[in-house]
Structure formats: structure tokens, C-alpha cells
């Protein structure tokens, strides 16, 4: 058992049929010695008496808020949550496995630039009695500060018969050094509590590996005189790190006909303009990637050819 | 470069960008493989990193690029020695068309651009001997290449920025 926060405790349980559970000692936070009784949750049933109580916790019915009373007055509370371990593996019932980029990916994180700011998100089908808290640091043995904001419900989607909820959090490294080579990874730890179930999820990454630039902006087409060709140009996204002579992007461009089956020629360039043949009803698209490190490509920015 | 002269920024830019391409072709899936393990915080200390105080940021380069260039050169020599060691030459053998050979040569080329013959800066010691098991060697190769990708990315940014803003 360990203290999650004041008066909230997590009981770690090996979860299998007829498991003996854990014996947990509760002490009433009062100078009183006599006439103390204990109840669990809203049930008024007195389960024990005395300043100290030893309870066997082996299932969710044993978790909840234990309150000690004297003469009808509540003296103190202890909320017990359960953290299940099945076959040596901590439960992951609350969050959905996003399976990208690999199985058992519950947290996904992205950064738009090298400023030390990043966003993490996760998915669940649970809609009520759910709370999250997030901590983050750079490195674990001698952690450096990362400050995370409040967790927000960022999207709701219908998936077949189920509703899926996406939660996200934004974090910022306290002393980011965008130009340096990261030596220690960022660690993100999410505590999830659903009713009386506690779970924790972690992710470890370098900012450089989660970079995904915003799409290029200001796509423009300029037809060339007496030619089927057009000059296309675009700009670095506003959110990308500066100066661009240092934090450079590379681009992938393509012209896509109306039919998805039509062959697309992709061209890679470090410039912010190109000359392409852009037929009527086609569209021109461009995406960006860090020029020197193969992290994710941005989403496509597109503009119709006509 | 030693003694304060400027490097051939444009040449360094080209070669460092080529190094980036080679490092990724030598181990393309690095971004999707989680090779970090318990204790990695300690093992990464052997490798020279371009750190915050090394003056490799745009402002630091403008003030005095020598500190940064010296750090980059130390790293290049370190990785060049690693790629020439039995970590890479031992079993399992690299494929004949492996880019590691080109990567090795390019590391040497760039380090020489930063230090013409006759000048000698102190360099770090080659790391401890390589592991004996082939599977351990393979894992170490991946870790080294992953770390090299991060190192050459910063070096390439430095030379791109230098070529754009510091060239005479």
C-alpha cells in the first residue's frame, strides 16, 4: 500500500481467484482513543471499532472511503483504491491500446517544434467516474522539470456501438534547450482512476522522435505563361522552430488527380517552391519533415489546381 | 578551423547532410524501435553529446563558433572510431552494400574538414571493449546508430546555419 495523495491510498493486489489479498492497517486521525467506530462509503453499517483497524482487501467491495466516527461525527477519512496485477502485469483496463506505432501504446505524444512543448493524448470508452493526473520530467534518476497543464477532454467519437473519448494534456520542459542533442528522455506518467480502480501509464521519448511539424502554410499557385506548368510556393508553418536556417525542413510535394487510383509522382525538395504540371481538377499537396532527422511528416496541405 | 579560422561552411553543410541520410539508411527504423532500457541514462554518458553549453545554438555560433566546432569534431572522431571498431567489423558481418562503410568514411571526411593536417585537438578515448556475443553487438550497433542520428542532425543544423549566416 502507498499514499497517492493525502488520505488516498493505493492497494496493490495480485488478482487471481481466491487470492488472499492484502492486510491494510487504518488509523483514525484523532487524539481520541475510545468510542471510535468505522464505516465504509455511504453504508451506515459499522464494520469495526477502535482507533486502529486491520482490514483484508481482496476485491473492489473492500475498497472505498473508510470513515472513523465518534458520537455521530466523522473524524477522518481514508480512501482505498485498488491496483490490480494479473499474471505479474499491471492492469490496463481504463485506456485503449492505440497500437501505433506498436502494440501496448496507451499514450501518444507529439511536438510541433523543438521548444520543449509537447502534447500527449489517450483514448478510453469510459465516460463517467474517471479522473486523470499527469506528471512529467526529463530523465528519471536525476529528473529535470517539466510542467504539465490540466487534462482536457479533447474529442468524442462514435466507434460502432461505442463512444470513444480522447483526453489530452500539454506539457512544457522548464529549461528547454532546442539546439542541444537530447541525452535523457522525457518521461510522462499518467495516473488514471475509474471509480475505485487505479492504473498508471507511462511513456518515455526524446522530443526529436515525436516531432511532427504543422503543415506548410500559404500554398500558392502561379501559372507560367505559355506553359502547362505552374510555380507553386509555400512557407514554413508558424509553429516551427526558428531560425529556419538552423531548424530546416524538407518537403514532399505531389499532384493528385481527381481519381485516387491515378499515379502520383512525389518530389522531395528542401526549397519552398517548385514547378509542377497541375492539370484541371487535380490538386497540389505539400507536407514537411525535419530536414536532418527522420521524425514524422506533417499532414498534407493542399490547394486545387484550377 | 583551429586557431580561429572559419571552416568551409558550405562543404561541411553538404557533407553533414549526407551523413544524416547515411545514418538513417544504415538504421532506418530507429524511430520506431524502443532500444532504451533500464540503466540507459548511465550508458549514454560514454557518448559525446552536443549539450546546451557547447555554443551550438544560433546565438552561440554567432558569438564564437569554435567551441561548438570543437565539440562536433570530438563527436565525429568518437563515432568514426566506433564504426571502425570490432563492434561493426565483427560478427554478425555487415551486408556488402551496407551504408556503414560510407558512413564511416564520411565521418572521417568531415572531421578532417574541421581539422586540416598538422592540427591536433585532444580527442576522447574510444569506449570500452565491444561485447562478445553477436546479438549484444547487434543491439549495440543499433544504439550507436540511433545516437549518431541525433548527433549528426545537430551538426547538420550547425553547418546549415553557418553556411547561411556565417560564410564570408
Amino acid at each position: 500500500i502507498w499514499e497517492l495523495k493525502k488520505d488516498v491510498y493505493v492497494v496493490e493486489l495480485d488478482w487471481y481467484p481466491d487470492a488472499p489479498g492484502e492486510m491494510v492497517v487504518l488509523t483514525c486521525d484523532t487524539p481520541e482513543e475510545d468510542g471510535i467506530t468505522w464505516t465504509l462509503d455511504q453504508s451506515g453499517e459499522v464494520l469495526g471499532s477502535g482507533k486502529t483497524l486491520t482490514i483484508q482487501v481482496k476485491e473492489f467491495g473492500d475498497a472505498g472511503q473508510y470513515t472513523c466516527h465518534k458520537g455521530g461525527e466523522a473524524l477522518s477519512h481514508s480512501l482505498l483504491l485498488l491496483h490490480k496485477k494479473e499474471d505479474g502485469i499491471w492492469s490496463t483496463d481504463v485506456l485503449k491500446d492505440q497500437k501505433e506505432p506498436k502494440n501496448k501504446t496507451f499514450l501518444r505524444c507529439e511536438a510541433k517544434n523543438y521548444s520543449g512543448r509537447f502534447t500527449c493524448w489517450w483514448l478510453t470508452t469510459i465516460s463517467t467516474d474517471l479522473t486523470f493526473s499527469v506528471k512529467s520530467s526529463r530523465g528519471s534518476s536525476n529528473p529535470q522539470g517539466v510542467t504539465c497543464g490540466a487534462v482536457t477532454l479533447s474529442a468524442e467519437r462514435v466507434r460502432g456501438d461505442n463512444k470513444e473519448y480522447e483526453y489530452s494534456v500539454e506539457c512544457q520542459e522548464d529549461s528547454a534547450c532546442p539546439a542541444a542533442e537530447e541525452r535523457l528522455p522525457i518521461e510522462v506518467m499518467v495516473d488514471a482512476i475509474h471509480k475505485l480502480k487505479y492504473e498508471n501509464y507511462t511513456s518515455s521519448f526524446f522530443i526529436r522522435d515525436i516531432i511532427k511539424p504543422d503543415p506548410p502554410k500559404n500554398l500558392q499557385l502561379k501559372p507560367l505563361k505559355n506553359s502547362r506548368q505552374v510555380e507553386v510556393s509555400w512557407e514554413y508553418p508558424d509553429t516551427w522552430s526558428t531560425p529556419h536556417s538552423y531548424f530546416s525542413l524538407t518537403f514532399c510535394i505531389q499532384v493528385q488527380g481527381k481519381s485516387k487510383r491515378e499515379k502520383k509522382d512525389r518530389i522531395f525538395t528542401d526549397k519552398t517552391s517548385a514547378t509542377v504540371i497541375c492539370r484541371k481538377n487535380a490538386s497540389f499537396s505539400v507536407q514537411a519533415q525535419d530536414r536532418y532527422y527522420s521524425s514524422s511528416w506533417s499532414e498534407w496541405a493542399s490547394v486545387p489546381c484550377s | 578551423v583551429p586557431g580561429g579560422s572559419s571552416p568551409a561552411w558550405a562543404q561541411c553543410q553538404q557533407l553533414s547532410q549526407k551523413l544524416c541520410t547515411l545514418a538513417w539508411s544504415a538504421h532506418p527504423l530507429v524511430g520506431h524501435m524502443d532500444l532504451r532500457e533500464e540503466g540507459d541514462e548511465e550508458t549514454t554518458n560514454d557518448v559525446p553529446h552536443i549539450q546546451c553549453g557547447d555554443g551550438c545554438d544560433p546565438q552561440g555560433l554567432r558569438d564564437n563558433s569554435q567551441f561548438c566546432l570543437q565539440r562536433i569534431r570530438q563527436g565525429l572522431i568518437f563515432y568514426e572510431k566506433l564504426l571502425g571498431s570490432d563492434i561493426f567489423t565483427g560478427e554478425p558481418s555487415l551486408l556488402p552494400d551496407s551504408p556503414v562503410g560510407q558512413l564511416h568514411a564520411s565521418l572521417l571526411g568531415l572531421s578532417q574538414l574541421l581539422q586540416p593536417e598538422g592540427h591536433h585537438w585532444e580527442t576522447q578515448q574510444i569506449p570500452s571493449p565491444s561485447p562478445s556475443q553477436p546479438w549484444q553487438r547487434l543491439l549495440l550497433r543499433f544504439k550507436i546508430l540511433r545516437s549518431l542520428q541525433a548527433f549528426v542532425a545537430v551538426a547538420a543544423r550547425v553547418f546549415a546555419h553557418g553556411a547561411a549566416t556565417l560564410s564570408p
Epitope: 489479498g21 453499517e45 459499522v46 464494520l47 483484508q56 482487501v57 481482496k58 476485491e59 473492500d62 | -
Partner: nanobody, 114 residues
Framework: EVQLVESGGGLVQPGGSLRLSCAAS????????MFWLRQAPGKGLEWLST???????IYPGSGKGRFTISRDNAKNTLYLQINNLKPEDTALYYC????????RGQGTQVTVSS
């Protein structure tokens, strides 16, 4: 009508053990929280242990000590195992449906003496 019948008491030497039983009827035993209480001569009721329908147990103090509560829902029976008996364990032992003993049996006498 609720009936609780305790048995298993008797005269025991110090250091000995006893297993008390309580046969329950007239209510849904398998879904009830059950208690063992005792009353020593000239003293008030003392709570010894609690067991929930699932078999999870609750004891006073910081450990179950010499007392072990258990139940068999199939037999509608509650048990109390007492080890290393001491003279001060001499008392009337009751099983009950509440900690105050408002619904309890007639009790079974345990006497510890050499």
C-alpha cells in the same frame, strides 16, 4: 425469524486452541456482514472481528493476532479460531449481525484455566 446458535466453547488450558461455530438461519446469511463479540464477567461487549459476504475480514488493532474469523456460505456457518488462549480470554462469545450485538445468539462460554 433470525436465529444464531453458537457452539464449540468449553474449558481449555492456557496455550490451547478452540474453534467456535455459529449456525445461522432465518435470513440470507451469504449476503450478510457477520461479527464475533465477547463479554467477560463484569465487562461490556468487546468486538473481536468482522467478515464480509465475500470472506474479507476486519480485525481491531494492527493485526489479526490470535483470532481468525471465517465463514462457509454453503453451510450458513460462521467460525472463530482462537489460538494460544489466555486466562483473560475467559468470556461468553457471541456471533452477531451487527457490531452492537442487537441481533446475536445466546453465546458459548469459553473458560481458560489450568
Amino acid at each position: 425469524e433470525v436465529q444464531l446458535v453458537e457452539s464449540g466453547g468449553g474449558l481449555v488450558q492456557p496455550g490451547g486452541s478452540l474453534r467456535l461455530s455459529c449456525a445461522a438461519s432465518g435470513f440470507t446469511f451469504s449476503s450478510s456482514v457477520m461479527f464475533w463479540l465477547r463479554q467477560a464477567p463484569g465487562k461490556g461487549l468487546e468486538w473481536l472481528s468482522t467478515i464480509k459476504p465475500t470472506g474479507s475480514t476486519i480485525y481491531p488493532g494492527s493485526g489479526k493476532g490470535r483470532f481468525t474469523i471465517s465463514r462457509d456460505n454453503a453451510k450458513n456457518t460462521l467460525y472463530l479460531q482462537i489460538n494460544n488462549l489466555k486466562p483473560e480470554d475467559t468470556a461468553l462469545y457471541y456471533c452477531a449481525r451487527d457490531i452492537g450485538g442487537t441481533v446475536r445468539g445466546q453465546g458459548t462460554q469459553v473458560t481458560v484455566s489450568s
